[in-house]
């Protein structure tokens, strides 16, 4: 039986050109995490394998950095990065757990009261 739960950073609104950290945390299970995949829609962004370490998809190499931890840092954000991101935890013996984070990237000129973030 799958008892675990995934906690995420929560949805994030960020400014174009900035950076954000996407993080998920698997709790309430003793299952072993064998691999974490980060995906957007149907695109694979990165893999963190327990044995082999990180692999960043070539098309994202310039703008995606591994970590912190099993998280992912997205840099030089564009409006087209807006969308849903998935952290997919492959575990043994439980199976697969998925967390979801929606990222909205806004033009810096959008002045709708500044609920946006930029990591220096």
């Amino acid at each position: 039986m799958m008892t675990g739960t995934i906690e995420t950073t929560g949805n994030i609104s960020a400014e174009k050109g900035g950076s954000i950290i996407l993080q998920c945390h698997l709790s309430s299970t003793t299952a072993q995490v064998t691999q974490v995949n980060w995906e957007q829609q149907d695109q694979l962004l990165a893999i963190c394998n327990a044995d082999l370490g990180w692999h960043i998809s070539p098309s994202f190499k310039d703008r995606v950095a591994p970590g912190p931890g099993l998280g992912l840092t997205l840099q030089s954000l564009t409006v087209n990065d807006t969308g849903e991101y998935f952290c997919i935890y492959h575990t043994y013996p439980d199976g697969t757990y998925t967390g979801r984070i929606f990222l909205e990237v806004l033009e810096s000129s959008v002045a709708e009261h500044g609920a946006r973030f930029q990591i220096p």
Epitope: G10, I12, Q41, F102, E104, E112, H113
Partner: antibody
Framework: EVQLQQSGPELVKPGASMKISCKAS????????MNWVKQSHGKNLEWIGL????????SYNQKFKGKATLTLDKSSSTAYMELLSLTSEDSAVYFC????????????WGRGTSVTVSS | DVVVTQTPLSLPVSFGDQVSISCRSS???????????LSWYLHKPGQSPQLLIY???NRFSGVPDRFSGSGSGTDFTLKISTIKPEDLGMYYC?????????FGGGTKLEIK
Amino acid sequence: EVQLQQSGPELVKPGASMKISCKASGYSFTDYTMNWVKQSHGKNLEWIGLIIPYNGGTSYNQKFKGKATLTLDKSSSTAYMELLSLTSEDSAVYFCARGLRGYFAMDYWGRGTSVTVSS
Amino acid sequence: DVVVTQTPLSLPVSFGDQVSISCRSSQSLANSYGVTYLSWYLHKPGQSPQLLIYGISNRFSGVPDRFSGSGSGTDFTLKISTIKPEDLGMYYCLQGTHQPWTFGGGTKLEIK
């Protein structure tokens, strides 16, 4: 003035599929996400999902994955929601609503489309 | 999914009253950057729902200042300082911090 004009009420048979339209005017259609919301029994509201006009991305409530398909036509500033394999549980009022940028909220809503599933 | 619980279910009022509606979530609605996406809506019969408050406490354009929002974490409140006839209807809170977005069950503001 922002307006979201939804298609009219529908009476459909169980097992059929149907498409609701939501025509946007008064703003730049591609600058805002479009959300869809279900209201059952005149009370409960459920978020179905959203579509991102500028890149075509979608986000669904898993409960509605396989039930609702969100699409759009940028040339006519119209968002669509197709409801598949309808059952009596799908009888409800469906709203489209524009996303409020930066706040994961909905600022302007359509009038709603009433869908009745009955044989 | 995050469960959002609204109380009371029904709120009988007299015009001029001050009322509060509570909205509680099953987990914190603050994201990792400390920002909370909690909004409030009024739905009158035969009309479209209307946005009142977003980001906990920001009044949407055209919303009278008798409406105010407050709270943090898992506990939020909508206050209406002086009830007017046009305020009657169903009130809903919505959390947009976690996927999927979820609404409270609604509070019906009705005349005593």
